[in-house]
């Protein structure tokens, strides 16, 4: 059976947008007017995940693109990735872990953690035009909060 | 508090169409699916189709297509479900309820429904 | 389409029993199910979602489980309110399916 996919755009708590930056990298900088036509859209597909009370598994894939964003150990190290995948088989109801996102929801404010590495968040940074990466820490410098919005199928 | 309410009763002829609304409040309109159910009389449940009135994204039953039209608007945050082409055995009550985006807390408040009746 | 028996159609018990409702299904519906108690003339009440979780305001002798294709609705120890027709629902893939309902009477 078909995954359940909505399409929607991101931005972090300091209302930073999300744009590709180069094939396979994310970050975050501040839009307006036309310019904001450059953030991503995500398709985000409810997907199969273990049983939790406030967490909603999620994988976060690029709207018509192959990739997705996924967690893997680069130098001992959880780090955000976005992957290629073969668009045939992607994507699916079980998702491989390490493209599955815990979606936390308080208030429509929603952070995503690892399922590959629980504590780990999709993060950005207080600096403009950085990376998207996955952080360790919550509550830091470093922001984990994110609003979202949907966008026309 | 969160309700959603209904339009009133309707008497229709076969062959001719139906629109219900539904409006919502108490909550964030366009994060929620509004569901449309129908329950002939004495049966059970039966699900017609849904709206996401965030993102326009739009299901239906595969055994109403073509004959079922589902809006929102988001202006009012009331959805509409349109039947056409009634027959008697579209009489029913038919219900709205809402979904979180997520689907995490299933269909979790209802309409008070609509009874629709067909006949000549 | 997901093929779905709910079971007991029918049962009638006392106050203060234990009961138990069904619902199996042709493949894993994975989290994706809420059960509802309707009474004459009123719309469906959610009582469970995701399964398992007791929707707010519902007295905890309700209860869901399972995993996969079978699930279960307890009622630990029935009472008077507690008669009515049950439904469940699941919504993990279109369309939508209810179970055809159990109605639970009075012995």
């Known amino acids: 059976a078909p995954v359940r996919s909505l399409n929607c755009t991101l931005r972090d708590s300091q209302q930073k947008s999300l744009v590709m930056s180069g094939p396979y990298e994310l970050k975050a900088l501040h839009l307006q007017g036309q310019d904001m036509e450059q953030q991503v859209v995500f398709s985000m597909s409810f997907v199969q995940g273990e049983e939790s009370n406030d967490k909603i598994p999620v994988a976060l894939g690029l709207k018509e693109k192959n990739l997705y964003l996924s967690c893997v150990l680069k130098d001992d190290k959880p780090t955000l990735q976005l992957e290629s995948v073969d668009p045939k088989n992607y994507p699916k109801k079980k998702m491989e872990k390490r493209f599955v996102f815990n979606k936390i929801e308080i208030n429509n404010k929603l952070e995503f953690e690892s399922a590959q590495f629980p504590n780990w968040y999709i993060s950005t940074s207080q600096a403009e035009n950085m990376p998207v990466f996955l952080g360790g820490t919550k509550g830091g410098q470093d922001i984990t909060d994110f609003t979202m919005q949907f966008v026309s199928s | 508090q969160v309700q959603l309410v209904q339009s009133g009763a309707e008497v229709k002829k076969p062959g001719s169409s139906v629109k219900v609304s539904c409006k919502a409040s108490g909550y964030t309109f366009d994060r929620y699916w509004i569901e449309w159910v129908r329950q002939a009389p004495g049966q059970g449940l039966e699900w017609m189709g849904e709206i996401l009135p965030g993102s326009g994204d739009i299901n239906y039953n595969e055994k109403f297509k073509g004959r079922v039209t589902i809006t929102a608007d988001k202006s009012t945050s009331t959805a509409y479900m349109e039947l056409s082409s009634l027959r008697s055995e579209d009489t029913a009550v038919y219900y709205c309820?809402?979904?979180?985006?997520?689907?995490?807390?299933?269909?979790?408040?209802w309409g008070q429904g609509t009874l629709v009746t067909v006949s000549s | 389409d997901i093929q779905m028996t709910q079971s007991p159609s029918s049962l009638s018990a006392s106050v203060g029993d234990r009961v138990t409702i069904t619902c199996k299904f042709s493949?894993?519906?994975?989290?994706?199910l809420t059960w509802f108690q309707q009474k004459p003339g009123k719309a469906p009440k959610s009582l469970i979602y995701?399964?398992?979780r007791l929707v707010d305001g519902v007295p905890s002798r309700f209860s869901g489980s399972g995993s996969g294709t079978d699930f279960t609705l307890t009622i630990s120890s029935l009472q008077p309110e507690d008669f009515a027709t049950y439904y469940c629902?699941?919504?993990?893939?279109?369309?939508?399916?209810f179970g055809g309902g159990t109605k639970v009477e009075i012995k």
């Open positions: 629902i699941q919504y993990d893939e279109f369309p939508y399916t």
């Open positions: 995701r399964v398992k």
């Open positions: 309820a809402r979904m979180y985006y997520d689907y995490d807390q299933g269909f979790d408040y």
């Open positions: 493949q894993d519906i994975d989290r994706f």
